[in-house]
Interface confidence: low
């Protein structure tokens, strides 16, 4: 025979074709073998000119041989080489699908691979590609868009060889709150890690504000608006600074009175204060908390205490905010000036969380009177707020 070729090669099959011998022959003997594959020999009729090779190993170079037989006579052997395709990975599945994340899992192909090409595309045409290692059988997709259909495809790679692609289709979950107005809504969207988030005042995307969300304390969902922890930030600031806010949201900071007014105007909020000092902790929760606008000098409303720190904020309820350059307190002296801080002073304070860090002189430091008195500056303090009905919202989300 002559002109031995292979066609229709897949990962497990190929078709061998040849030109018949000029003389009439009884049969053709076909044999094929690959690396680490035992030789297979088949005898076919002498009027056959093709033979389907099956059960081949993927991504394997085979040597194919054929010769003709007529009685005891054998023709010379002709040879051809071919390489089977790389087989595809199997069972590509998207699981743990959330609003912005999903987990892709698959089973590896039979052939050894040098990696995988993952392609995922949203309906709007955004395509992302990633190459992962040969031992990987799962990949976490992140930064996906909520409520979006995605097609994920995977292809096995082995050097220059590429398998056929397989695909799966999934849809990300829609966000409960596309523009969360506070940290509780961010949490109800599924964000459960404490850190920096963007909230949108009144749910208006033009009113974006970066805040630090505490997603762990007492169920999470808190906007942290004050943190004292190391004394690196100067809290002896003027009215303008306290209105606008200052500091690093990850470290020591004050969120700003204007922001507090806008946030608490969105609904009924509760206040939580966390205090920590030399291994001791205390907290205070007030189930009604609000801050008025600039015209009221950011008047404080704080009611409904519970906790372990003692009810020191009651003393300040109904007071306007004071700084060293805008004295609104009821004392003859300027409380902010006297005590080197700023607060909703009265005459002067039971609480001075914006006082001088580490200063144990009377009433000068970071004080919470009913916990540590006025002669101990507390090492760590956070003030934070969330909707008073957060527990109901959380329960409703869990039921949903």
């Amino acid at each position: 025979p002559s002109g031995l070729v292979t066609a229709n090669i897949t990962d497990s099959e190929a078709l061998a074709r040849w030109q018949p011998a000029i003389a009439t022959v009884d049969s053709y003997v076909i044999s094929y073998t690959g690396e680490k594959v035992p030789e297979i020999t088949r005898t076919v009729s002498g009027n056959t000119v093709e033979y389907a090779l099956t059960d081949l190993e993927p991504a394997t170079e085979y040597t194919l041989r054929i010769f003709a037989e007529k009685g005891p006579q054998k023709s010379s052997t002709i040879t051809a080489k071919f390489t089977t395709d790389l087989d595809s990975p199997r069972d590509l599945t998207a699981t743990e699908v959330q609003s912005e994340t999903a987990l892709l899992t698959w089973r590896p192909p039979r052939a050894s691979v040098t990696g995988y090409l993952l392609v995922y595309e949203s309906v709007d045409g955004t395509v992302k590609e990633v190459i992962v290692g040969p031992d990987t059988t799962s990949y976490s997709l992140a930064d996906l868009s909520p409520s979006t259909h995605y097609t994920a495809k995977i292809q096995a790679l082995n050097g220059p060889l590429r398998s056929n692609m397989i695909q799966t289709i999934f849809t990300t979950i829609g966000l409960l709150y596309p523009f969360p107005k506070d940290c509780s809504q961010a949490m109800l969207n599924g964000d459960t890690t404490s850190g920096l988030y963007t909230i949108y005042l009144n749910g208006d995307k033009a009113e974006a504000l970066e805040v630090f969300c505490d997603m762990t304390s007492d169920g999470g969902g808190w906007i942290v608006f004050l943190r004292r922890k190391n004394g690196r930030e100067n809290f002896y600031q003027n009215w303008k600074a306290y209105a606008a806010g200052f500091g690093d949201r990850r470290e020591e900071f004050w969120l700003g009175l204007d922001n507090l007014n806008k946030i608490t105007a969105q609904g009924q909020y509760e206040l939580r204060v966390d205090l920590r000092d030399h291994g001791e902790t205390a907290f205070a929760v007030y189930d009604k908390f609000s801050v008025g606008d600039a015209k009221t000098r950011y008047k404080l409303k704080v009611e409904g205490y519970s906790g372990t720190a003692g009810d020191s904020m009651a003393y300040h309820n109904g007071r306007s905010f004071s700084t060293f350059d805008k004295d609104t307190d009821s004392a003859i002296t300027n409380c902010a000036l006297s005590y080197k801080g700023a607060f909703w002073y009265r005459n002067c304070h039971r609480v001075n969380l914006m006082g001088r860090y580490g200063d144990n002189n009377h009433s000068q430091g970071v004080n919470w009177f009913h916990w540590k008195g006025h002669e101990h500056s507390i090492q760590f303090a956070e003030m934070k707020l969330r909707p008073s009905n957060f527990r109901n919202l959380e329960g409703r989300r869990k039921r949903a």
Epitope: D218, R250, R276, G279
Partner: antibody, heavy 120, light 107 residues
Amino acid sequence: QVQLVESGGGLVQPGRSLRLSCAASGFTFDDYAMHWVRQAPGKGLEWVSGISGSGGSTYYADSVKGRFTISRDNAKNSLYLQMNSLRAEDTALYYCAKDISAVPDTFDIWGQGTMVTVSS
Amino acid sequence: DIQMTQSPASLPTPVGDRVTITCRASQYIQGFLNWYQQKPGKAPKLLIYDASNLETGVPSRFSGSGSGTDFTLTISSLQPEDFATYYCQQSYSTPQTFGQGTKVDIK
């Protein structure tokens, strides 16, 4: 004086259940989160589960999620760990630990531990 | 989960020497780091909380420093009772995770 005493450990076959208890004294129990931390023989510490002071929030390590349940009875100053579908890799000394806060934070007081051995 | 990596794993040290143990977090944890001491057959004991705060009753030769991702526990002058295994632990987020431990033994 603050004290935590664990009990309930022992030898158990794989797939079976065990309930650990921790009796607390010397502090206002419901003001603090409580935890279970384990230590396999010759190995390091592994946090297993925690519960807030009120009992309203519970937290689990991925390795025990769905199998273990933490609970507390503030009236009895007691912490519990219900361990189901036990595996050989759950073999460890289980410590009860008090937090410094009402929510998960830092473990300031530890019990002496109770040994759990999972073996057929 | 946040991974905590401690080094070295073992630290043979003579009495009186200064000891430094480092701990690295796989992500930013501010100062939410604690150090524990564990002696053989005993429960762990809190030494340092919030990266640098000495727990009540802990000798002042122990100190902690660092923030963000890199932290250090220092024993200024090692005493015989300090031979133990030391663990760092992050309390930034649940699940709280521990380093693999550093065994300080007698050289």
